[in-house]
Interface confidence: low
């Protein structure tokens, strides 16, 4: 088997990978390069919270309906060290983070930044997962969709260094004037794995936990501190929060945090995983999951061990869903499908034989109608039922994966593309 | 209902060391941080250190190495204790919960009388 | 370390008479998010403090509406409208805003 399913980035390493981003990058700007609004009635704003201060507190991105449309679009890399972090998770010189800096630091996401809240309704939460060397802002397209759809979006920056780079403060007075320390991606090496990987997946998930008390003790009236400045008064999220509709999705690495905070944490009403990584859970999670789950994949990341340990979740009494996207690759969730033009996305595997717009369109419909039927919402996305069942040209049911041959190597296969 | 419930000695010989377990309920540990406050005899209070949420402790610079706060948060409890206490120590020990710079709740507070 | 001080350190009050306390920071206490994170307490005797307003003017649930809280900057004002009798004990001033927290020395309320 191939050497990439063991080490999660050892095959971006290779010069080849390299010189194809040197090359490629300087045109990467060229061609559709816009992360699309949201396809909701709702306006979007976005901004961020950090409680506490530490490594160990909540750091997160919030979408969220906005009051009004006329700020301005929110940064969408917002800091120079997401770019060395992310030269650093490619395997690449860390001047390389430079250039990718030149090529994005300026580029925008739809959502109006620190936008008031848009009041008189009670909306339901998702807390979303980045995947392995992603962070907080790299699924603003999810994010926003959901949001101009009535969604509270949290998306958490995790600090278990799966983050290609996430930031802290050392103490409070660091925090007062804005000095940061930077925590970066850790490598592993082979023989770490495994249990370093269950230990992230199972810190990953008291995160989207702690984001969740930490978002409806801000709904109850708490007055929360953001450690960042900014100009975004949180008491307006005071019972802005539908407490009984609570989601939980992430993609890759963030796939299998869906499951494993699922297994620990009713509170979340249902989870999606967008083509989850499934070798960081234990075996003792797949039994642990009541809630009802929805398992969104692309065409050409999956492989037979990773989806045996999908259908290790299933059983008679417990809702399951599966749908595979035509055409589509692993990164066809995260933004930076949006963020080259076609021939080098193609290249760089960003994007795949489907159109990226089509791709996260039937991806966040198909969540939509999964969402509204599991959390009960009283909206139209019940229009997308079909979707859930991979009732479209450009979906499967189920998968396209054949698991019948059961001499698959399933304790190392672990199986990584790019950004997780 | 939250609380805060405090358990410890009531006396202390000079120089011996003071532990203070208090317990909490109706909250977690990992969303609330909890904080220690004394007051002297006929005196106000006085911050000693917190325990953040998430695991780290701040102290009031002039305790900062005799004092050291812990929890276990499965067990919904955070651990005091203070080193070479004296005389001028003698007070009422509180923790509260805190959050986000606002006093919320207090413990019944422990009375420790540093004497021989 | 930030100071408060409190004034006047005794208050002898009627009870159904209106009452104020002033404290006094060494620094602004608006935080950079707009916020004034400045707190009262009320230690009534033999027990432990309860918080009675926070964020300056903002009352805990089950404060009676007599308290009011008021400032900004370095200045701010705990006032009652109408002394009871339940009232008496001793009110501290805390910041939030800078670390460490610190407290004002405190007021005595008194019924005459």
């Known amino acids: 088997f191939d050497w990439q399913y063991i080490n999660p980035v050892a095959h971006m390493k290779s010069s080849a990978w390299v010189n194809k981003i040197q090359v490629l990058m300087a045109a990467a700007s060229f061609g559709q390069t816009k992360i699309p609004r949201g396809n909701g009635p709702y306006s979007v704003g976005c901004t961020d919270l950090m409680f506490d201060h530490t490594n160990k507190g909540t750091f997160l991105r919030l979408y969220y309906p906005s009051q009004d449309n006329d700020r301005l679009d929110t940064l969408w890399i917002p800091n120079k060290e997401y770019f060395w972090g992310l030269s650093k998770f490619l395997g690449t010189h860390w001047l390389m983070g430079n250039i990718l800096r030149l090529l994005f630091g300026s580029m925008t996401t739809p959502a109006n930044w620190n936008s008031p809240l848009r009041p008189g309704e009670k909306y339901p939460l998702v807390v979303f997962s980045h995947g392995l060397g992603a962070f907080r802002t790299l699924y603003s397209a999810i994010g926003i969709d959901l949001a101009s759809h009535g969604f509270i979006v949290a998306a958490v920056e995790h600090r278990d260094r799966s983050a290609s780079a996430t930031y802290y403060f050392k103490d409070q007075s660091a925090a007062e004037i804005g000095d940061k320390s930077w925590l970066y991606l850790r490598t592993l090496k082979q023989e770490e794995e495994t249990h370093i990987r269950n230990e992230q997946v199972r810190q990953r998930a008291k995160e989207c936990s702690q984001a969740l008390s930490l978002i409806l003790d801000i709904d109850h009236g708490k007055p929360v501190k953001n450690a960042l400045d900014l100009k975004f008064d949180m008491e307006q999220l005071k019972d802005s929060i539908d407490r009984e509709k609570i989601a939980v999705i992430g993609h890759s690495f963030g796939g299998a945090t869906v499951i494993q905070t699922l297994s620990e944490d009713q509170r979340f009403r249902c989870g999606i995983a967008l083509d989850a990584w499934m070798f960081p859970l234990g075996d003792e999670v797949y039994s642990r999951i009541p809630q009802p789950l929805f398992f969104i994949n692309s065409e050409y990341f999956q492989y037979p061990a990773n989806i045996i340990k999908m259908k290790k979740c299933y059983s008679p009494d417990k809702e399951r869903k599966m749908i595979t996207i035509r055409g589509s690759v692993h990164q066809n969730f995260a933004d930076f499908t949006f963020a080259t033009g076609k021939i080098i996305g193609h290249m760089l595997k960003l994007k795949g034989d489907i159109d990226s717009n089509v791709a996260i369109d039937l991806s966040n419909k198909a969540s939509l109608a999964f969402l509204q039927k599991h959390l009960g919402l009283h909206k139209d996305f019940d229009q997308w039922d079909c979707l859930i069942e991979g009732d479209d040209e450009n979906l499967i049911p189920g998968t396209n994966i054949n698991t019948t041959n059961q001499h698959i190597m399933l304790q190392n296969s672990s199986g990584i593309e790019k950004y997780n | 209902e939250v609380q805060l419930e405090q358990s410890g000695p009531g006396l202390v010989q000079p120089s011996q060391s003071l532990s203070i377990t208090c317990t909490v309920s109706?909250?977690?540990?990992?969303?609330?941080?909890v904080l220690w406050v004394r007051q002297s005899p006929g005196k106000g209070l006085e911050w000693l250190g917190i325990i953040w949420s998430g695991g780290s402790a701040d102290y009031n610079a002039a305790f900062i190495s005799r004092l050291s706060i812990t929890k276990d948060n499965s067990k919904s409890q955070v651990f005091f204790e203070m080193n070479s206490l004296q005389a001028n120590d003698t007070a009422i020990y509180y923790c509260?919960?805190?959050?986000?710079?606002?006093?919320?709740?207090w413990g019944q507070g422990t009375s420790v009388t540093v004497s021989s | 370390d930030i100071v408060l001080t409190q004034s006047p350190l005794t208050l002898s009050v009627t009870i159904g008479q209106p009452a104020s306390i002033s404290c006094k920071s060494s620094q602004s206490l608006l935080y950079s998010n707009g916020k004034s994170f400045l707190n009262w307490l009320l230690q009534r005797p033999g027990q432990s403090p309860k918080r009675l307003i926070y964020?300056?003017?903002k009352l805990d649930s089950g404060v009676p509406d007599r308290f009011t809280g008021c400032g900004s900057g370095k200045d701010f004002t705990l006032k009652i409208s109408r002394v009871e009798a339940e009232d008496l004990g001793v009110y501290y001033c805390v910041q939030g805003t800078h670390f460490p927290q610190t407290f004002g020395g405190g007021t005595k309320l008194e019924i005459k």
């Open positions: 509260a919960s805190y959050y986000i710079n606002a006093l919320d709740y």
């Open positions: 109706g909250f977690s540990l990992t969303t609330y941080d």
């Open positions: 964020l300056v003017s």
